[in-house]
């Protein structure tokens, strides 16, 4: 492991479309990849009238946009579907929304998926 970097070996997995995709609905996903590549976790969710609906969570490929992010935070202003990525085991277990242009409280504090 490189000093100062959180190595990602597993992420929280969730798939709202698990029946159609024929995957598990929820669990822990081991992250595979080339040894010289970084691995990340991600989360995608929707905010439906203030109610958080998780779409997907899991491992994410080596992505410069995720480097050195220990927390999973969406910074884009009011996206249709929220996305965040991070480094570190299970770092996608909690996620939040802090739009870059505004100084406001996150609309979603750390959230975890409801059990099936």
């Amino acid at each position: 492991a490189i000093l100062g970097r959180s190595e990602t070996q597993e992420c929280l997995f969730f798939n709202a479309n698990w029946e159609k995709d024929r995957t598990n609905q929820t669990g822990v996903e081991p992250c595979y990849g080339d040894k010289d590549k970084r691995r990340h976790c991600f989360a995608t969710w929707k905010n439906i009238s203030g109610s958080i609906e998780i779409v997907k969570q899991g491992c994410w490929l080596d992505d410069i946009n995720c480097y050195d992010r220990t927390d999973c935070v969406e910074k884009k202003d009011s996206p249709e579907v929220y996305f965040c990525c991070c480094e570190g085991n299970m770092c996608n277990e909690k996620f939040s929304y802090f739009p870059e242009m505004e100084v406001t409280q996150p609309t979603s504090n750390p959230v975890t998926p409801k059990p099936p």
């Epitope: 479309n17 159609k20 995709d21 024929r22 992250c31 595979y32 990849g33 691995r39 991600f42 995608t44 997907k56 899991g58 491992c59 994410w60 490929l61 992505d63 410069i64 946009n65 996206p79 249709e80 579907v81 929220y82 996305f83």
Partner: antibody, heavy 120, light 107 residues
């Protein structure tokens, strides 16, 4: 080196059958989901079918559902596409591709393709 | 199914030109977007994954950007070997779908 090599294409009459093969090398075949993508002459890319690494889960485009069957033999490192009740609109170059097992699951690499022509 | 729309469908450019290709999804796909290059008679080749990450071995003149529904592939200085057809592909939901392609031709 990771390689995929398709075979089995050819000329077939409407209503006929054909089985395509894709021989994989250079990686642990059973660890990866695989896909078939086709390209009609002068047209774009169309996803046809996919299969999980174990072979337990299979997926099909609506245009081929009930006519095509995807399968794999992990002991032979080979992917198959059985095509039945072929139609003129199935004429295309068929590519096999490895699907990344980590999101966003890009298709890499691709085989060189095999041409299927459905004509009387 | 998610529809992917590319524009333009074709363009003519000269060596050294900056070329921009856009891809629009019918609904948000966050960053689940990959770009491929296909040369005549050859198989497609992965260029960019996750909207903006260069695949190993792809020259740095290629770049990708965007998230949500709108994405861009840019070639900063077109080279002779870049004349090809480019496709975007979403992997956010099943079935994965491709854009119609953008053919980059020599002016």
């Amino acid at each position: 080196e990771v390689q995929l090599l398709e075979s089995g294409g050819g000329l077939v009459q409407p209503g006929g059958s054909l089985r395509l093969s894709c021989a994989a090398s250079g990686f642990t075949f059973s660890h990866y989901a695989m896909t078939w993508v086709r390209q009609a002459p002068g047209k774009g890319l169309e996803w046809v079918s996919g299969i999980s690494g174990s072979g337990l889960n299979t997926y099909y485009a609506d245009s081929v559902k009930g006519r095509f069957t995807i399968s794999r033999d992990n002991s032979k490192n080979t992917l198959y596409l059985q095509m039945n009740s072929l139609r003129a609109e199935d004429t295309a170059v068929y590519y096999c591709a490895r699907r990344g097992h980590t999101m966003p699951q890009p298709l890499d690499p691709w085989g060189q393709g095999t041409l299927v022509t459905v004509s009387s | 199914d998610i529809q992917m729309t590319q524009s333009p469908s074709s363009l003519s450019a000269s060596v050294g030109d900056r070329v921009t290709i856009t891809c629009r999804a019918s609904q948000s796909i966050t960053r689940f977007l990959n770009w491929y290059q296909q040369k005549p008679g050859k198989a497609p080749k992965l260029l960019i994954y996750a909207a903006s990450n260069l695949q190993v071995g792809v020259p740095s003149r290629f770049s990708g950007s965007g998230s949500g529904t709108d994405f861009t592939l840019t070639i900063s200085s077109l080279q002779p070997e870049d004349f090809a057809t480019y496709y975007c592909q979403q992997s956010y939901s099943t079935p994965p779908t491709f854009g119609g392609g953008t053919k980059v031709e020599i002016k």
